[in-house]
Amino acid sequence: AVNGTSQFTCFYNSRANISCVWSQDGALQDTSCQVHAWPDRRRWNQTCELLPVSQASWACNLILGAPDSQKLTTVDIVTLRVLCREGVRWRVMAIQDFKPFENLRLMAPISLQVVHVETHRCNISWEISQASHYFERHLEFEARTLSPGHTWEEAPLLTLKQKQEWICLETLTPDTQYEFQVRVKPLQGEFTTWSPWSQPLAFRTKPAALGKDT
């Protein structure tokens, strides 16, 4: 296998996007590199230009079709190659036989909104984006709430072990500003990982009513 001192990691968003990151020890000269995708049972192939994300790391997104189109299935294997320009030719820098449904990372949940807020609790809902219908209900979520004076890293994780696109946050402090994030993961796939965290949703609990607690 072509590896050398490089690392080539890709994830499928379950619909029409494969995102890849390639890391290479030792600086490359100003050269053009690409990821090529060749499915074993499809008529199409796809290419994306690797762009630097750090001194020794490059990334790109293989757009396989319309965002909600189901471009790959559990039986597909896609040969992914990193090719870099040398002279007039391309050199294979890294290669992997990619099983899309073993390497899943969904898009971050979207459309977060406060359904109902009180002094001590808040009900929040969200939607999943570009997730395959193959999963049916086989998804799990993690959520976290940012309290004043704390960091996201300190926030305790709330786990939802089923496809539940809402949460009721309890024991909140009245009249306090919070932020909330959620992420999603399919149960399927040996190398499947959590989606990125959603954009934070800011909300404020209601102030306590004078003389009584609602």
């Epitope: 490359l28 002279g87 007039v88 030719r89 294979v92």
Partner: antibody, heavy 121, light 112 residues
Framework: EVQLVQSGAEVKKPGASVKVSCKAS????????ISWVRQATGQGLEWMGE????????YYNEMFKGRVTMTRDTSISTAYMELSSLRSEDTAVYYC??????????????WGQGTTVTVSS | DVVMTQSPLSLPVTLGQPASISCRSS???????????LEWFQQRPGQSPRLLIY???NRFSGVPDRFSGSGSGTDFTLKISRVEAEDVGVYYC?????????FGGGTKVEIK
Amino acid sequence: EVQLVQSGAEVKKPGASVKVSCKASGYTFTDYVISWVRQATGQGLEWMGEIYPGDANTYYNEMFKGRVTMTRDTSISTAYMELSSLRSEDTAVYYCARGSYTYDNYAMDFWGQGTTVTVSS
Amino acid sequence: DVVMTQSPLSLPVTLGQPASISCRSSQNIVHSNGNTYLEWFQQRPGQSPRLLIYKVSNRFSGVPDRFSGSGSGTDFTLKISRVEAEDVGVYYCFQGSHIPWTFGGGTKVEIK
């Protein structure tokens, strides 16, 4: 059957230019690179550079930059190598060779028969 | 540029006997992708070069199994297990790891 057929021998005066052709058959011309390699009499092999006929992109060995020009005519599946400001040291056999556009395994698999270029006053 | 040095310059051999050619590169020719693009070419008298071995030890299609390649880093060897009359010619090593690609000076194999 892959074949690369080169033009005939040339005799040139110092300071002149020579243009060697290489006609490809037996494969899709625009799918492979054409490399040029020269061999001075009784000497070893020297890689001069190459052209990708698909987009006419070229890469020249620094040693020949400014004097060598590689071109192609896809309509007749032919690659050309022109060397200018000839000197006696350019007397050599010039080979074209086919190479994969993606260098996975080897640089050159099939070679032309060679064209002898003699530079003499 | 990577300088490829071959030895010996000339190699007289007896038919049916083994032969060994050495090739040394002036710097490591492991490509940054982890592969070593060391190739061997044979040039019979009056003919064009012919690819024998690629990536150190892989025989090109149609090449007899009496030819084998080995080595790593900067030191490489081409072996002919039992020399036949048709093996007479000049053998060149070649590195395709670092542009400009370069050839060794050649080793002439002749029959004693």
